[in-house]
Protein backbone atom coordinates (compact mmCIF):
# COMPACT_ATOMS: atom_id res chain seq x y z
CA UNK A 1 0.00 0.00 0.00
CA UNK A 2 1.07 3.59 -0.63
CA UNK A 3 0.88 6.08 2.45
CA UNK A 4 -2.05 5.76 4.36
CA UNK A 5 -5.02 8.82 4.15
CA UNK A 6 -4.60 11.85 5.96
CA UNK A 7 -7.87 13.38 8.04
CA UNK A 8 -8.28 16.70 9.64
CA UNK A 9 -9.29 15.86 12.89
CA UNK A 10 -6.12 12.85 13.41
CA UNK A 11 -2.73 12.43 12.01
CA UNK A 12 -0.46 9.19 11.64
CA UNK A 13 1.77 7.73 15.08
CA UNK A 14 5.37 8.00 13.30
CA UNK A 15 6.53 8.58 10.27
CA UNK A 16 4.75 7.83 7.21
CA UNK A 17 6.66 5.19 4.94
CA UNK A 18 6.67 5.82 1.17
CA UNK A 19 5.19 1.71 1.39
CA UNK A 20 3.59 -0.59 3.28
CA UNK A 21 3.39 -4.45 3.11
CA UNK A 22 0.34 -6.33 2.80
CA UNK A 23 -1.12 -6.82 6.31
CA UNK A 24 1.09 -4.13 8.16
CA UNK A 25 -1.06 -1.65 10.50
CA UNK A 26 -1.11 1.99 11.04
CA UNK A 27 -2.43 3.80 14.16
CA UNK A 28 -3.66 7.31 14.58
CA UNK A 29 -4.23 9.36 17.19
CA UNK A 30 -6.51 12.48 17.48
CA UNK A 31 -4.84 15.86 16.26
CA UNK A 32 -4.14 18.80 18.52
CA UNK A 33 -7.31 20.44 19.45
CA UNK A 34 -9.50 16.73 18.90
CA UNK A 35 -10.23 14.09 21.50
CA UNK A 36 -10.94 10.64 20.86
CA UNK A 37 -14.05 9.24 22.40
CA UNK A 38 -14.38 5.43 21.94
CA UNK A 39 -15.57 3.14 20.34
CA UNK A 40 -14.74 3.85 16.74
CA UNK A 41 -11.16 1.98 15.89
CA UNK A 42 -8.60 5.05 15.16
CA UNK A 43 -6.30 2.02 13.16
CA UNK A 44 -6.19 0.75 9.35
CA UNK A 45 -4.63 -2.46 7.40
CA UNK A 46 -3.32 -2.57 4.34
CA UNK A 47 -5.30 -5.00 2.79
CA UNK A 48 -4.50 -7.70 0.01
CA UNK A 49 -5.81 -5.72 -2.89
CA UNK A 50 -3.12 -2.94 -2.11
CA UNK A 51 -5.76 -0.29 0.03
CA UNK A 52 -6.57 0.50 3.27
CA UNK A 53 -9.22 -1.00 5.10
CA UNK A 54 -11.79 1.75 5.53
CA UNK A 55 -11.21 4.04 8.48
CA UNK A 56 -12.54 7.65 9.71
CA UNK A 57 -11.92 10.38 12.07
CA UNK A 58 -15.49 10.65 13.16
CA UNK A 59 -14.18 9.22 16.53
CA UNK A 60 -12.13 12.52 17.22
CA UNK A 61 -13.99 15.29 18.39
CA UNK A 62 -12.95 19.37 18.25
CA UNK A 63 -12.18 20.16 21.96
CA UNK A 64 -14.91 22.04 23.36
CA UNK A 65 -14.76 25.38 25.63
CA UNK A 66 -16.20 24.96 29.39
CA UNK A 67 -20.27 24.86 30.03
CA UNK A 68 -21.17 28.87 30.70
CA UNK A 69 -24.67 28.99 32.39
CA UNK A 70 -27.23 31.11 31.74
CA UNK A 71 -26.57 34.65 33.13
CA UNK A 72 -28.80 35.21 35.83
CA UNK A 73 -31.74 37.07 34.36
CA UNK A 74 -30.62 36.25 30.57
CA UNK A 75 -29.67 33.90 28.05
CA UNK A 76 -26.30 32.47 27.11
CA UNK A 77 -26.59 30.61 23.22
CA UNK A 78 -24.31 29.04 21.27
CA UNK A 79 -24.44 29.77 17.70
CA UNK A 80 -23.48 27.35 16.10
CA UNK A 81 -25.55 25.08 18.28
CA UNK A 82 -21.41 23.48 19.96
CA UNK A 83 -19.30 24.97 22.86
CA UNK A 84 -16.28 23.31 19.92
CA UNK A 85 -13.47 25.62 19.42
CA UNK A 86 -13.98 28.27 16.38
CA UNK A 87 -17.20 29.09 17.31
CA UNK A 88 -19.39 31.54 19.24
CA UNK A 89 -21.62 31.92 22.67
CA UNK A 90 -24.06 34.60 22.45
CA UNK A 91 -25.74 36.11 25.37
CA UNK A 92 -28.59 38.05 25.46
CA UNK A 93 -31.15 39.36 28.55
CA UNK A 94 -34.32 39.01 29.32
CA UNK A 95 -36.83 41.90 28.74
CA UNK A 96 -35.96 44.88 31.65
CA UNK A 97 -32.40 44.11 31.94
CA UNK A 98 -29.39 45.25 29.82
CA UNK A 99 -26.09 43.54 29.39
CA UNK A 100 -22.65 44.29 31.02
CA UNK A 101 -19.84 43.13 28.98
CA UNK A 102 -19.53 40.82 25.93
CA UNK A 103 -22.09 40.19 24.07
CA UNK A 104 -20.63 37.52 22.19
CA UNK A 105 -17.88 35.39 23.44
CA UNK A 106 -15.26 32.98 21.16
CA UNK A 107 -14.36 29.86 21.68
CA UNK A 108 -10.78 29.99 21.01
CA UNK A 109 -7.68 27.12 20.79
CA UNK A 110 -5.03 28.16 22.41
CA UNK A 111 -2.42 25.03 22.44
CA UNK A 112 -4.42 21.84 22.64
CA UNK A 113 -6.79 23.78 25.18
CA UNK A 114 -10.29 25.26 24.16
CA UNK A 115 -11.23 28.61 26.30
CA UNK A 116 -13.31 31.44 25.77
CA UNK A 117 -11.98 34.41 24.75
CA UNK A 118 -13.36 36.43 28.07
CA UNK A 119 -15.57 36.46 30.61
CA UNK A 120 -18.95 36.03 30.54
CA UNK A 121 -21.29 39.29 31.26
CA UNK A 122 -24.35 40.12 33.39
CA UNK A 123 -27.52 41.29 32.91
CA UNK A 124 -28.41 43.94 35.27
CA UNK A 125 -31.97 45.45 35.90
CA UNK A 126 -32.85 48.23 33.76
CA UNK A 127 -33.15 51.34 36.38
CA UNK A 128 -33.96 55.03 35.20
CA UNK A 129 -33.21 58.23 37.32
CA UNK A 130 -36.47 60.36 38.39
CA UNK A 131 -38.45 62.17 35.70
CA UNK A 132 -37.92 65.45 34.86
CA UNK A 133 -39.44 67.65 37.19
CA UNK A 134 -42.09 70.21 35.44
CA UNK A 135 -43.10 73.88 35.58
CA UNK A 136 -46.69 74.29 37.49
CA UNK A 137 -47.09 70.79 37.90
CA UNK A 138 -45.85 67.43 39.59
CA UNK A 139 -45.43 63.97 39.17
CA UNK A 140 -46.33 60.68 41.03
CA UNK A 141 -43.36 58.61 43.54
CA UNK A 142 -41.75 62.22 43.32
CA UNK A 143 -40.22 60.96 46.50
CA UNK A 144 -38.34 57.70 44.71
CA UNK A 145 -35.18 58.34 43.77
CA UNK A 146 -34.88 55.09 41.46
CA UNK A 147 -37.15 53.63 39.11
CA UNK A 148 -36.97 49.94 37.65
CA UNK A 149 -37.85 49.14 34.15
CA UNK A 150 -41.74 49.83 33.43
CA UNK A 151 -42.62 51.69 36.50
CA UNK A 152 -44.62 54.52 35.34
CA UNK A 153 -45.20 57.80 36.73
CA UNK A 154 -48.27 60.05 36.02
CA UNK A 155 -47.96 64.20 35.72
CA UNK A 156 -50.55 66.63 36.81
CA UNK A 157 -50.92 70.23 36.88
CA UNK A 158 -51.24 72.43 39.50
CA UNK A 159 -53.86 74.60 40.36
CA UNK A 160 -53.66 78.02 38.42
CA UNK A 161 -52.88 81.23 40.64
CA UNK A 162 -55.61 83.01 38.04
CA UNK A 163 -59.03 82.44 36.34
CA UNK A 164 -57.90 80.14 33.96
CA UNK A 165 -56.54 76.91 34.81
CA UNK A 166 -53.35 75.25 33.97
CA UNK A 167 -53.65 72.25 30.72
CA UNK A 168 -51.75 69.53 30.51
CA UNK A 169 -49.90 69.21 27.46
CA UNK A 170 -48.24 65.95 25.85
CA UNK A 171 -49.03 62.45 27.79
CA UNK A 172 -49.96 62.63 31.38
CA UNK A 173 -48.06 59.22 32.14
CA UNK A 174 -44.67 58.01 31.07
CA UNK A 175 -42.79 54.76 32.23
CA UNK A 176 -39.20 53.63 32.45
CA UNK A 177 -38.33 51.68 29.09
CA UNK A 178 -35.44 49.98 27.81
CA UNK A 179 -32.50 52.20 27.81
CA UNK A 180 -32.53 53.56 30.82
CA UNK A 181 -34.53 56.31 29.01
CA UNK A 182 -38.24 57.23 29.72
CA UNK A 183 -40.70 56.55 27.24
CA UNK A 184 -41.47 60.41 25.90
CA UNK A 185 -40.80 63.59 26.85
CA UNK A 186 -42.32 65.01 30.02
CA UNK A 187 -45.67 66.80 29.34
CA UNK A 188 -45.93 70.71 30.33
CA UNK A 189 -48.42 72.73 31.98
CA UNK A 190 -49.29 75.88 31.03
CA UNK A 191 -52.49 78.18 30.68
CA UNK A 192 -54.02 77.46 26.94
CA UNK A 193 -57.21 79.56 25.61
CA UNK A 194 -58.51 79.94 22.50
CA UNK A 195 -60.72 83.07 21.05
CA UNK A 196 -64.13 83.01 20.96
CA UNK A 197 -64.49 81.21 17.58
CA UNK A 198 -66.93 83.53 15.31
CA UNK A 199 -68.25 82.68 12.01
CA UNK A 200 -70.42 84.83 10.07
CA UNK A 201 -73.42 83.97 8.18
CA UNK A 202 -72.90 80.43 10.29
CA UNK A 203 -73.40 79.20 13.56
CA UNK A 204 -71.84 77.18 16.20
CA UNK A 205 -73.64 73.62 16.46
CA UNK A 206 -71.74 71.93 19.36
CA UNK A 207 -68.96 72.76 22.08
CA UNK A 208 -70.74 75.51 23.70
CA UNK A 209 -69.18 77.48 26.37
CA UNK A 210 -67.88 80.83 27.57
CA UNK A 211 -64.00 79.69 28.00
CA UNK A 212 -62.26 77.42 25.24
CA UNK A 213 -59.05 75.78 26.81
CA UNK A 214 -56.79 73.23 25.24
CA UNK A 215 -58.57 70.41 23.54
CA UNK A 216 -61.74 72.40 23.64
CA UNK A 217 -63.90 71.16 20.07
CA UNK A 218 -66.61 73.01 18.37
CA UNK A 219 -68.57 72.02 15.45
CA UNK A 220 -70.03 74.65 13.00
CA UNK A 221 -72.03 75.18 10.03
CA UNK A 222 -73.26 77.33 7.46
CA UNK A 223 -76.40 79.52 6.90
CA UNK A 224 -78.68 78.65 4.11
CA UNK A 225 -77.22 79.83 0.99
CA UNK A 226 -74.02 79.90 1.90
CA UNK A 227 -70.97 76.82 2.04
CA UNK A 228 -68.09 76.07 4.29
CA UNK A 229 -64.85 77.22 3.57
CA UNK A 230 -62.23 75.00 6.41
CA UNK A 231 -63.20 72.23 8.29
CA UNK A 232 -66.70 72.21 10.28
CA UNK A 233 -64.82 71.01 13.41
CA UNK A 234 -61.96 72.90 15.31
CA UNK A 235 -60.22 72.28 18.20
CA UNK A 236 -57.98 74.81 20.42
CA UNK A 237 -54.40 73.46 20.27
CA UNK A 238 -51.18 73.83 22.78
CA UNK A 239 -50.69 77.68 21.29
CA UNK A 240 -53.94 79.13 21.82
CA UNK A 241 -54.95 79.04 18.18
CA UNK A 242 -57.91 76.92 16.40
CA UNK A 243 -56.72 74.35 14.29
CA UNK A 244 -57.70 74.09 11.44
CA UNK A 245 -58.22 77.72 11.14
CA UNK A 246 -61.71 79.27 11.94
CA UNK A 247 -63.71 78.55 8.76
CA UNK A 248 -65.59 81.09 6.87
CA UNK A 249 -69.33 81.03 5.34
CA UNK A 250 -68.87 81.80 1.64
CA UNK A 251 -72.26 82.72 -0.23
CA UNK A 252 -73.19 80.40 -2.82
CA UNK A 253 -73.33 81.97 -6.20
CA UNK A 254 -76.61 81.70 -7.94
CA UNK A 255 -76.26 79.27 -11.17
CA UNK A 256 -75.07 81.20 -14.09
CA UNK A 257 -76.72 80.51 -17.73
CA UNK A 258 -73.14 80.29 -19.68
CA UNK A 259 -72.12 76.53 -19.76
CA UNK A 260 -68.87 76.13 -18.13
CA UNK A 261 -65.70 74.82 -20.41
CA UNK A 262 -65.09 71.32 -19.95
CA UNK A 263 -62.38 70.75 -17.32
CA UNK A 264 -60.18 68.16 -16.91
CA UNK A 265 -60.11 66.63 -12.95
CA UNK A 266 -56.46 67.53 -12.75
CA UNK A 267 -58.00 71.12 -11.81
CA UNK A 268 -58.60 70.27 -8.02
CA UNK A 269 -56.98 71.23 -5.31
CA UNK A 270 -56.19 67.87 -3.87
CA UNK A 271 -55.62 64.28 -5.62
CA UNK A 272 -58.63 63.41 -3.33
CA UNK A 273 -62.02 63.22 -4.31
CA UNK A 274 -63.53 65.74 -1.97
CA UNK A 275 -64.61 69.22 -2.59
CA UNK A 276 -62.44 72.22 -2.33
CA UNK A 277 -64.45 72.88 0.43
CA UNK A 278 -63.12 70.33 2.54
CA UNK A 279 -59.53 70.94 2.00
CA UNK A 280 -57.81 71.74 4.57
CA UNK A 281 -54.33 72.71 2.93
CA UNK A 282 -52.78 72.81 -0.63
CA UNK A 283 -53.63 76.10 -3.13
CA UNK A 284 -57.30 77.39 -3.61
CA UNK A 285 -59.16 77.49 -6.55
CA UNK A 286 -60.92 80.58 -7.74
CA UNK A 287 -63.95 79.18 -8.89
CA UNK A 288 -66.74 78.08 -5.78
CA UNK A 289 -68.38 74.98 -5.55
CA UNK A 290 -71.96 74.82 -6.76
CA UNK A 291 -74.32 73.71 -4.06
CA UNK A 292 -75.00 69.77 -5.97
CA UNK A 293 -71.02 69.21 -4.54
CA UNK A 294 -70.15 67.07 -7.37
CA UNK A 295 -66.10 68.24 -7.46
CA UNK A 296 -65.91 67.18 -11.24
CA UNK A 297 -68.13 70.02 -12.44
CA UNK A 298 -67.34 73.38 -11.00
CA UNK A 299 -69.42 76.77 -11.82
CA UNK A 300 -66.88 79.07 -12.54
CA UNK A 301 -67.52 82.73 -10.50
CA UNK A 302 -68.60 84.78 -13.45
CA UNK A 303 -69.05 81.98 -16.26
CA UNK A 304 -65.03 81.95 -16.73
CA UNK A 305 -61.92 80.91 -14.74
CA UNK A 306 -59.53 83.31 -13.59
CA UNK A 307 -56.52 81.47 -14.81
CA UNK A 308 -55.81 77.81 -16.33
CA UNK A 309 -52.61 76.66 -16.34
CA UNK B 1 -38.99 29.49 30.61
CA UNK B 2 -37.31 26.44 28.99
CA UNK B 3 -39.34 22.82 28.97
CA UNK B 4 -38.71 19.54 27.61
CA UNK B 5 -42.15 17.85 27.76
CA UNK B 6 -42.38 14.00 27.04
CA UNK B 7 -44.10 11.43 25.03
CA UNK B 8 -46.65 8.98 27.30
CA UNK B 9 -46.15 5.70 28.88
CA UNK B 10 -45.52 2.66 26.88
CA UNK B 11 -46.07 -1.61 26.85
CA UNK B 12 -43.92 -3.06 24.58
CA UNK B 13 -43.79 -6.67 23.77
CA UNK B 14 -39.91 -7.96 23.78
CA UNK B 15 -38.46 -7.78 20.53
CA UNK B 16 -40.89 -4.97 19.28
CA UNK B 17 -39.47 -1.27 19.17
CA UNK B 18 -40.59 1.94 21.16
CA UNK B 19 -39.95 5.90 19.89
CA UNK B 20 -40.22 8.04 22.02
CA UNK B 21 -40.55 11.99 22.08
CA UNK B 22 -39.10 15.04 23.80
CA UNK B 23 -41.00 18.27 22.85
CA UNK B 24 -38.83 21.63 23.64
CA UNK B 25 -39.72 24.98 24.31
CA UNK B 26 -38.08 28.13 25.65
CA UNK B 27 -35.08 28.46 24.04
CA UNK B 28 -33.37 28.13 20.38
CA UNK B 29 -33.75 24.35 19.62
CA UNK B 30 -31.34 24.33 16.85
CA UNK B 31 -28.16 25.90 19.66
CA UNK B 32 -27.91 22.69 21.91
CA UNK B 33 -27.80 19.13 21.81
CA UNK B 34 -30.24 16.39 23.61
CA UNK B 35 -29.01 13.57 25.58
CA UNK B 36 -31.16 10.55 26.52
CA UNK B 37 -30.63 8.95 30.08
CA UNK B 38 -32.51 6.12 31.42
CA UNK B 39 -33.48 4.71 34.31
CA UNK B 40 -34.22 0.61 35.20
CA UNK B 41 -36.45 0.27 38.84
CA UNK B 42 -34.97 1.41 41.66
CA UNK B 43 -31.53 2.11 39.95
CA UNK B 44 -29.25 4.83 38.80
CA UNK B 45 -29.02 6.76 36.01
CA UNK B 46 -27.58 5.47 32.58
CA UNK B 47 -26.23 7.57 29.79
CA UNK B 48 -27.93 6.40 26.28
CA UNK B 49 -26.68 9.15 24.04
CA UNK B 50 -26.53 12.37 22.41
CA UNK B 51 -27.87 14.30 19.47
CA UNK B 52 -26.57 17.67 18.26
CA UNK B 53 -30.05 19.53 17.29
CA UNK B 54 -27.77 21.79 15.25
CA UNK B 55 -26.17 18.69 12.85
CA UNK B 56 -27.80 15.94 13.44
CA UNK B 57 -24.37 14.76 14.85
CA UNK B 58 -24.60 11.31 17.14
CA UNK B 59 -23.13 9.60 19.92
CA UNK B 60 -24.39 6.76 21.35
CA UNK B 61 -23.34 4.59 24.34
CA UNK B 62 -21.24 1.36 23.63
CA UNK B 63 -23.59 -0.97 25.42
CA UNK B 64 -26.56 0.64 22.57
CA UNK B 65 -25.05 0.89 19.23
CA UNK B 66 -26.42 -0.61 16.45
CA UNK B 67 -29.98 -0.68 18.69
CA UNK B 68 -30.90 2.86 19.67
CA UNK B 69 -31.60 5.96 16.98
CA UNK B 70 -31.43 9.60 18.08
CA UNK B 71 -33.24 11.92 15.14
CA UNK B 72 -34.62 15.46 15.74
CA UNK B 73 -37.04 17.05 13.87
CA UNK B 74 -35.88 21.28 14.33
CA UNK B 75 -39.31 22.23 12.45
CA UNK B 76 -41.35 21.13 15.62
CA UNK B 77 -38.50 21.46 18.15
CA UNK B 78 -38.78 17.93 19.21
CA UNK B 79 -35.88 15.04 19.64
CA UNK B 80 -36.57 11.59 19.06
CA UNK B 81 -35.24 8.35 20.79
CA UNK B 82 -36.24 5.53 19.20
CA UNK B 83 -35.10 1.96 20.80
CA UNK B 84 -35.15 -1.68 19.33
CA UNK B 85 -35.52 -5.31 19.71
CA UNK B 86 -36.27 -4.49 23.44
CA UNK B 87 -35.73 -6.96 26.00
CA UNK B 88 -37.26 -7.00 29.60
CA UNK B 89 -33.98 -5.26 30.97
CA UNK B 90 -35.21 -2.06 28.51
CA UNK B 91 -38.04 -1.61 31.10
CA UNK B 92 -36.98 2.14 32.83
CA UNK B 93 -37.85 5.69 32.92
CA UNK B 94 -36.55 7.47 29.95
CA UNK B 95 -35.10 10.99 30.07
CA UNK B 96 -34.04 13.62 27.82
CA UNK B 97 -32.13 16.35 28.78
CA UNK B 98 -30.81 19.42 27.38
CA UNK B 99 -26.58 19.61 27.01
CA UNK B 100 -23.61 19.35 24.95
CA UNK B 101 -21.15 16.93 24.41
CA UNK B 102 -18.76 17.98 27.37
CA UNK B 103 -21.34 19.46 28.75
CA UNK B 104 -24.16 19.48 31.77
CA UNK B 105 -27.95 17.92 31.90
CA UNK B 106 -29.21 21.64 33.02
CA UNK B 107 -32.60 20.94 31.72
CA UNK B 108 -34.90 17.37 31.95
CA UNK B 109 -37.74 15.93 30.79
CA UNK B 110 -40.45 14.88 32.94
CA UNK B 111 -39.61 11.23 31.60
CA UNK B 112 -41.53 8.48 30.17
CA UNK B 113 -41.96 5.02 31.60
CA UNK B 114 -41.19 1.86 29.06
CA UNK B 115 -42.26 -1.09 30.18
CA UNK B 116 -41.19 -4.31 28.18
CA UNK B 117 -43.01 -6.99 29.27
CA UNK B 118 -44.69 -10.72 27.67
CA UNK C 1 -14.65 3.68 30.11
CA UNK C 2 -14.14 6.01 33.32
CA UNK C 3 -15.74 4.51 36.55
CA UNK C 4 -17.32 6.69 39.51
CA UNK C 5 -17.79 5.46 43.07
CA UNK C 6 -19.43 7.38 45.72
CA UNK C 7 -19.71 6.97 49.19
CA UNK C 8 -21.68 6.57 51.49
CA UNK C 9 -24.27 5.17 48.91
CA UNK C 10 -26.59 6.19 52.15
CA UNK C 11 -26.53 9.07 54.05
CA UNK C 12 -28.94 9.37 57.01
CA UNK C 13 -29.17 13.09 58.24
CA UNK C 14 -30.26 15.60 60.67
CA UNK C 15 -32.17 19.05 59.24
CA UNK C 16 -29.49 21.73 60.06
CA UNK C 17 -26.36 19.61 60.29
CA UNK C 18 -23.77 19.47 57.36
CA UNK C 19 -23.68 16.59 54.98
CA UNK C 20 -21.04 15.24 52.73
CA UNK C 21 -20.47 13.35 49.55
CA UNK C 22 -17.37 11.88 47.98
CA UNK C 23 -17.30 10.63 44.51
CA UNK C 24 -14.02 8.78 43.06
CA UNK C 25 -12.90 8.83 39.59
CA UNK C 26 -11.17 5.50 37.85
CA UNK C 27 -8.90 8.57 36.08
CA UNK C 28 -8.55 12.13 36.37
CA UNK C 29 -11.17 14.17 35.10
CA UNK C 30 -8.96 17.47 35.08
CA UNK C 31 -8.81 18.37 31.44
CA UNK C 32 -5.80 20.42 30.22
CA UNK C 33 -7.75 23.82 30.21
CA UNK C 34 -7.79 24.02 33.89
CA UNK C 35 -11.43 22.69 34.57
CA UNK C 36 -13.11 19.31 35.87
CA UNK C 37 -15.15 17.58 34.32
CA UNK C 38 -17.43 16.66 37.17
CA UNK C 39 -21.52 17.42 37.45
CA UNK C 40 -23.47 16.58 40.81
CA UNK C 41 -27.37 15.88 39.98
CA UNK C 42 -29.72 15.38 43.01
CA UNK C 43 -32.91 13.35 42.19
CA UNK C 44 -35.69 14.20 44.57
CA UNK C 45 -38.50 11.18 45.20
CA UNK C 46 -40.61 11.16 42.01
CA UNK C 47 -39.07 14.05 40.36
CA UNK C 48 -36.39 14.43 37.08
CA UNK C 49 -33.09 14.48 37.83
CA UNK C 50 -31.73 18.43 38.59
CA UNK C 51 -28.08 20.12 38.01
CA UNK C 52 -26.44 20.83 41.29
CA UNK C 53 -22.80 21.76 40.71
CA UNK C 54 -20.94 21.98 37.34
CA UNK C 55 -17.54 21.62 36.45
CA UNK C 56 -16.71 20.23 39.97
CA UNK C 57 -17.19 23.36 41.45
CA UNK C 58 -19.63 26.13 39.99
CA UNK C 59 -23.12 26.05 41.31
CA UNK C 60 -26.01 26.18 39.08
CA UNK C 61 -28.76 28.50 38.43
CA UNK C 62 -30.99 28.68 41.49
CA UNK C 63 -28.72 26.23 43.57
CA UNK C 64 -28.92 27.43 47.15
CA UNK C 65 -25.53 28.42 48.37
CA UNK C 66 -25.80 25.23 51.17
CA UNK C 67 -24.41 23.30 48.08
CA UNK C 68 -20.94 23.42 47.00
CA UNK C 69 -18.48 20.84 45.04
CA UNK C 70 -14.98 20.63 45.74
CA UNK C 71 -11.81 18.51 44.32
CA UNK C 72 -9.60 17.72 41.66
CA UNK C 73 -8.34 14.85 39.24
CA UNK C 74 -10.16 11.62 40.70
CA UNK C 75 -11.56 13.42 44.67
CA UNK C 76 -14.62 15.35 44.25
CA UNK C 77 -16.60 16.07 47.43
CA UNK C 78 -20.51 17.33 47.49
CA UNK C 79 -20.84 19.36 50.81
CA UNK C 80 -24.45 20.44 52.32
CA UNK C 81 -23.12 22.97 55.01
CA UNK C 82 -27.27 22.83 56.82
CA UNK C 83 -29.12 20.56 55.69
CA UNK C 84 -33.08 20.93 55.15
CA UNK C 85 -35.92 18.53 54.24
CA UNK C 86 -36.22 19.38 50.84
CA UNK C 87 -32.76 18.08 50.20
CA UNK C 88 -33.52 14.24 51.19
CA UNK C 89 -33.33 12.43 47.26
CA UNK C 90 -30.71 10.64 45.38
CA UNK C 91 -27.44 12.64 44.74
CA UNK C 92 -25.50 11.67 41.18
CA UNK C 93 -22.31 12.44 40.32
CA UNK C 94 -21.50 12.57 36.50
CA UNK C 95 -18.37 12.75 34.97
CA UNK C 96 -18.59 14.68 31.38
CA UNK C 97 -14.58 14.47 30.12
CA UNK C 98 -15.35 10.59 28.00
CA UNK C 99 -18.71 10.81 27.08
CA UNK C 100 -20.92 10.66 30.31
CA UNK C 101 -21.33 8.38 32.96
CA UNK C 102 -22.69 8.03 36.32
CA UNK C 103 -21.87 7.14 39.66
CA UNK C 104 -24.17 4.81 41.67
CA UNK C 105 -25.81 7.58 43.59
CA UNK C 106 -25.85 8.36 47.07
CA UNK C 107 -29.44 8.26 48.79
CA UNK C 108 -29.62 11.50 51.80
CA UNK C 109 -32.77 10.76 54.08
CA UNK C 110 -33.80 12.07 56.88
CA UNK C 111 -32.93 10.58 60.03
Known amino acids: CEEPPTFEAMELIGKPKPYYEIGERVDYKCKKGYFYIPPLATHTICDRNHTWLPVSDDACYRETCPYIRDPLNGQAVPANGTYEFGYQMHFICNEGYYLIGEEILYCELKGSVAIWSGKPPICEKVLCTPPPKIKNGKHTFSEVEVFEYLDAVTYSCDPAPGPDPFSLIGESTIYCGDNSVWSRAAPECKVVKCRFPVVENGKQISGFGKKFYYKATVMFECDKGFYLDGSDTIVCDSNSTWDPPVPKCLKVLPPSSTKPPALSHSVSTSSTTKSPASSASGPRPTYKPPVSNYPGYPKPEEGILDSLD | QVQLVQSGAEVKKPGASVKVSCKASGYTFTSYGISWVRQAPGQGLEWMGW????????NYAQKLQGRVTMTTDTSTSTAYMELRSLRSDDTAVYYC???????????WGQGTLVTVST | EIELTQSPLSLPVTPGEPASISCRSSQSLLHSNGYNYLDWYLQKPGQSPQLLIY???NRASGVPDRFSGSGSGTDFTLKISRVEAEDVGVYYCMQALQTFTFGPGTKVEIK
Open chain 2, 97 to 107: ARGMMRGVFDY
Open chain 2, 51 to 58: ISAYNGNT
Open chain 3, 55 to 57: LGS
